[in-house]
Structures are given as structure tokens and as C-alpha cells.
């Protein structure tokens, strides 16, 4: 058992049928010695008397808010949460495995640039009585500061018979150094509490590996005189790191016909313009990636040819 | 470069960009293979990193590019020695068309561009002997190449910026 915060305790349990559970001793935080009784949650049923209460915690029915009373007045509370360990592995009931980029990915994080700011998000099908808290640092043995904002419900989607909820958080490294080569990874730790269940999730990454630029902006087409060719141009997204002579992007461009089956040629360029053949009903698209490090490509930015 | 002269920024830019391409073709991102493990905070200390105080940011390059170029050269020599060591030459043998050979040569080429013959900056100590087990060697290769990818990305940014803003 360990203290999560004042008066909130986490009991770690091996979870299998007929498991013996954990013995927990609760102490009433009072100078009083006599006439103390104990109850669990809103139930008026007296569980025991005396300054301490010994309980065997085996299941969620044994968790909850224990209160010691004297003469009808509450003296102190202890909230017991359970953290399940099944076959030696901590439970991951609350969050959905996103399976991208690999199995057992519960937290996903992205950064739009090298400023040390990043966003993490996670998914759950649970709709009520759910709280999250997030901590982050660079490195773990001698951690350097990362400040995270409030967790927000960022999206709701219907998935078959169920609703799926997406939560996200934005974090900022306190002393970011965009031009340096990262030596220690960013660590992100999310505590999830659903009713009386406690779980924790972690992710470890370098900012360079979670970079995903915003799509290029200001796509423009300029038909060339007496030609089927078009000069296309675009700009770096506003959110990308500067100066662009240092933080350079590379681009992938393609012309997509009306039919999805139609063969599309992709061209790679470091420039912000190109000359292409852009037929009627087709569309021109461009996406961006860090020029020197193969992190994610941006989403496509598109414009119709006509 | 030594003694404060400017490097051939455009040549360095071309070669460093080629290094980036080679480093990624030598070890593409295989299913986002996560090679970081417990205790990695300590193991990464052996490798020279381009850090915040090394002057490799745009402002630092404008003020005095020498500190940064020295750090880059130290790293290039370190990795060049690693790629020539039995970590890469021992079992399991590299495939005949492996880009590691080209990568090795390009590291040497760029480090020489930064230090013409006759000049010798102090270089970092080569790392401890390589592991004996082939599987350990394979894992170490992956880790070295992942680390090299990050190093050459910063170097390439430095030379691109230098070519664009510091060339005579």
C-alpha cells in the first residue's frame, strides 16, 4: 500500500480468482482513543471499532472511502483504491490499446516542431467517474522539468455499439534546446482513476521521433502560358521551427486523378515550388517531413487543379 | 577550419545530407523498433552528443562556428571509428550491398573536410571493446545507427544553415 495523495491510498493486488488479497491497517487521524467506529462509503453498517481497523482487501467491494466516527461526527477519511496485477502485469483496463506504432501503445504523442512543446492523447470507452493526472520530465534518474497543462476531453466518436472518448494534454519542456541533439528521452506518466481503480501508463520518447509537421500552407497554382503544365508553390507551415535555413523540410508532391485507382506519381523535392501537369478534375497535394530526420510526414494539403 | 578559417559550407552541406540518407538506409525505422532500455541513460553517455552549450544553434554559429564544428568533427571521428570496429566488421557479417561501408567512408570524408591534413584536434576516446555475442553486436549496431541518425541530422542542419547564411 502506498499514498497517492493526502488520505488516498493505493493497494496493489495480485488479481486472480480466490486470491488472498492484502491485509491493510487503517488508523483514525485523531487524538481520541475511545468510542471510535468505522464505516465504508455511504453505508451506515459499522465495520469495527477502535482507533485502528484491520481489513483484508481482496476485491473492489473492499475498496472505497473508510471513515472513522465518534458520536455521529466524522473524524477522518481514507480512500482506498486498487491497482490490479494480473499474471505479473499491471492492469490496463481503462485505456484502449491504440496498436500504433506497435502493440501496447496506450499513450500517443506528437510534436509540431522542435520547441519542446508536445501533445499526448489516449482513448477510452469509459464515460464517467474518470480522472487523469499527468507528470512529465526529461530523463528519469536526474529529471529535468516538463510542465503539462490540464487534461481535456478532446473528441468523442461512435465506434460500433460504443462511444470512444479521446483525452489529450499539452506539455512544454521548461528549458528546451531545439538545436541540440537529445540525449535523454522525455518521460510521460499518466495516472488514471476510474471509480476505485488506479492504473498508470507511461511513454518514453525523443522529441525528434514524434515530430509531425503541420501540412504546408498557401498552396497556389499558376498555369503556364501555352502549356498543360502548372507551376505550384507552397510555404512552410507557421508552426514549424525557425529559421527554415536551419530547420529545413522536404516535401512529397503528387497529382491525384478523380479515380482513386489512377496511378499517381510522387515527386520528392526540397524546394517550395514545382512544375507539374495538372489535368481537370484532378487535385494537387503536398506533404512535409523533416529534411534530415525521418520522423512522420505531415497530413496532405490539397488544392483542385481546375 | 582550424585557426578560424571557414569550412567549405556547400560541400559540407551536400556530404552531411548524404550522410543522413545513408544513416537511414543503413537502419530504417523497422516497425518503430524501440531500442531504449532500462539503464540507457548511462550507456548514451559514451557517445559524443551535440549539446546546448556547443554553439550549434543559429545564434551560436553566427557568433563563432568553431566550437560547433569542433564538436561535429569529434563526433564524426568517433562514429567513423565505431563503424570500422569489429562491432560492424565482426559476425554477423553485413550484407554485401549494405550502406554501412559508404556511411563509413562519408563520415571520414566529412571529418577531413573539416580538418585538412596537418591539423589535429584532440578526439574523443574510442569506446570500450565490442560485445562477444553476435546478437549483442547486432543490437549495438542498431543503437549506434539510431544515435548516428540523430547526430548527423543536427550536423546537416548546421551545414545547411551555414551554407545559406555564412558562406562568403
Amino acid at each position: 500500500i502506498w499514498e497517492l495523495k493526502k488520505d488516498v491510498y493505493v493497494v496493489e493486488l495480485d488479481w486472480y480468482p480466490d486470491a488472498p488479497g492484502e491485509m491493510v491497517v487503517l488508523t483514525c487521524d485523531t487524538p481520541e482513543e475511545d468510542g471510535i467506529t468505522w464505516t465504508l462509503d455511504q453505508s451506515g453498517e459499522v465495520l469495527g471499532s477502535g482507533k485502528t481497523l484491520t481489513i483484508q482487501v481482496k476485491e473492489f467491494g473492499d475498496a472505497g472511502q473508510y471513515t472513522c466516527h465518534k458520536g455521529g461526527e466524522a473524524l477522518s477519511h481514507s480512500l482506498l483504491l486498487l491497482h490490479k496485477k494480473e499474471d505479473g502485469i499491471w492492469s490496463t483496463d481503462v485505456l484502449k490499446d491504440q496498436k500504433e506504432p506497435k502493440n501496447k501503445t496506450f499513450l500517443r504523442c506528437e510534436a509540431k516542431n522542435y520547441s519542446g512543446r508536445f501533445t499526448c492523447w489516449w482513448l477510452t470507452t469509459i464515460s464517467t467517474d474518470l480522472t487523469f493526472s499527468v507528470k512529465s520530465s526529461r530523463g528519469s534518474s536526474n529529471p529535468q522539468g516538463v510542465t503539462c497543462g490540464a487534461v481535456t476531453l478532446s473528441a468523442e466518436r461512435v465506434r460500433g455499439d460504443n462511444k470512444e472518448y479521446e483525452y489529450s494534454v499539452e506539455c512544454q519542456e521548461d528549458s528546451a534546446c531545439p538545436a541540440a541533439e537529445e540525449r535523454l528521452p522525455i518521460e510521460v506518466m499518466v495516472d488514471a482513476i476510474h471509480k476505485l481503480k488506479y492504473e498508470n501508463y507511461t511513454s518514453s520518447f525523443f522529441i525528434r521521433d514524434i515530430i509531425k509537421p503541420d501540412p504546408p500552407k498557401n498552396l497556389q497554382l499558376k498555369p503556364l502560358k501555352n502549356s498543360r503544365q502548372v507551376e505550384v508553390s507552397w510555404e512552410y507551415p507557421d508552426t514549424w521551427s525557425t529559421p527554415h535555413s536551419y530547420f529545413s523540410l522536404t516535401f512529397c508532391i503528387q497529382v491525384q486523378g478523380k479515380s482513386k485507382r489512377e496511378k499517381k506519381d510522387r515527386i520528392f523535392t526540397d524546394k517550395t515550388s514545382a512544375t507539374v501537369i495538372c489535368r481537370k478534375n484532378a487535385s494537387f497535394s503536398v506533404q512535409a517531413q523533416d529534411r534530415y530526420y525521418s520522423s512522420s510526414w505531415s497530413e496532405w494539403a490539397s488544392v483542385p487543379c481546375s | 577550419v582550424p585557426g578560424g578559417s571557414s569550412p567549405a559550407w556547400a560541400q559540407c552541406q551536400q556530404l552531411s545530407q548524404k550522410l543522413c540518407t545513408l544513416a537511414w538506409s543503413a537502419h530504417p525505422l523497422v516497425g518503430h523498433m524501440d531500442l531504449r532500455e532500462e539503464g540507457d541513460e548511462e550507456t548514451t553517455n559514451d557517445v559524443p552528443h551535440i549539446q546546448c552549450g556547443d554553439g550549434c544553434d543559429p545564434q551560436g554559429l553566427r557568433d563563432n562556428s568553431q566550437f560547433c564544428l569542433q564538436r561535429i568533427r569529434q563526433g564524426l571521428i568517433f562514429y567513423e571509428k565505431l563503424l570500422g570496429s569489429d562491432i560492424f566488421t565482426g559476425e554477423p557479417s553485413l550484407l554485401p550491398d549494405s550502406p554501412v561501408g559508404q556511411l563509413h567512408a562519408s563520415l571520414l570524408g566529412l571529418s577531413q573536410l573539416l580538418q585538412p591534413e596537418g591539423h589535429h584536434w584532440e578526439t574523443q576516446q574510442i569506446p570500450s571493446p565490442s560485445p562477444s555475442q553476435p546478437w549483442q553486436r547486432l543490437l549495438l549496431r542498431f543503437k549506434i545507427l539510431r544515435s548516428l541518425q540523430a547526430f548527423v541530422a543536427v550536423a546537416a542542419r548546421v551545414f545547411a544553415h551555414g551554407a545559406a547564411t555564412l558562406s562568403p
Epitope: Q42, V94, S127, T128, G160, K163, K195, K197 | -
Partner: nanobody, 124 residues
Framework: EVQLVESGGGLVQAGDSLRLSCAAS????????MGWFRQAPGKERSFVAA????????GYAGSVKGRFTISRDGVENMVFLQMNSLVPEDTGVYYC?????????????????WGQGTQVTVSS
């Protein structure tokens, strides 16, 4: 709309058996724990039995242990309560309830979805 519909209640003699069913619809309950609660006239709603999402773990109130059995059919979104050796103290309205998040609880306040209830009367 999420719905839990109980059926199978009725008037029986002490010592008889009844099987209650609960049909869940409006969402997939495959990741939810399910429980049965009862409310006798003039009393609080109290825990009877519950089953976790996989059907592997079950819990019972002391007064029904050994007499009642809870089970579930995940494919059909159904939960059952087999009640044997009924006694007059088992009389009350029986409610089916569901709680998100795989594990069951004994406190009614933790359950997210509730049925309308089915009356069970055991005469002596």
C-alpha cells in the same frame, strides 16, 4: 439509448427456484461488469451478486452465497441470476445494473446503468 430489461420474477413458495434474466442493449456491454441488487419494501437497495466482464470473477452477498449463481452470455449481452432454495427474506424488487470498466463493485453508487426491476415474492 442504453437499456437493461429484467425478466423472470414472480411469486414462488419458500424452497423453490427462479431464474432472472437481464437483456442489455444500446451499447456493447462486453467490457462492463454486471450486477444484481434488490430492494425490499422500506429498505435500501442492497447488493446481491455481480460478475466481471469476462465472467471469470463473481461476488455474492453473504446471505445468498451458495444459493444464488450469477452468469453471463457476452455474445447475447445477457446476464442471469439463478436463485435456488428461496426464503421469504429474498422478497423484493430485483434490479440489474452495469458498471463500465471490467470489474464489479458491491456499492450501488458505482453502477452506471440500471434496469427498471422485476418483482420477486417468496411466500412461506
Amino acid at each position: 439509448e442504453v437499456q437493461l430489461v429484467e425478466s423472470g420474477g414472480g411469486l414462488v413458495q419458500a424452497g423453490d427456484s427462479l431464474r432472472l434474466s437481464c437483456a442489455a442493449s444500446g451499447r456493447s456491454f462486453s467490457n462492463d461488469a454486471m450486477g444484481w441488487f434488490r430492494q425490499a419494501p422500506g429498505k435500501e437497495r442492497s447488493f446481491v451478486a455481480a460478475i466481471n466482464w469476462s465472467g471469470e470473477l463473481t461476488g455474492y452477498a453473504g446471505s445468498v452465497k451458495g444459493r444464488f449463481t450469477i452468469s453471463r452470455d457476452g455474445v447475447e449481452n445477457m446476464v442471469f441470476l439463478q436463485m435456488n432454495s428461496l426464503v421469504p427474506e429474498d422478497t423484493g424488487v430485483y434490479y440489474c445494473a452495469a458498471v463500465e470498466g471490467r470489474d464489479y463493485y458491491r456499492g450501488a453508487q458505482y453502477y452506471d446503468y440500471w434496469g427498471q426491476g422485476t418483482q420477486v415474492t417468496v411466500s412461506s
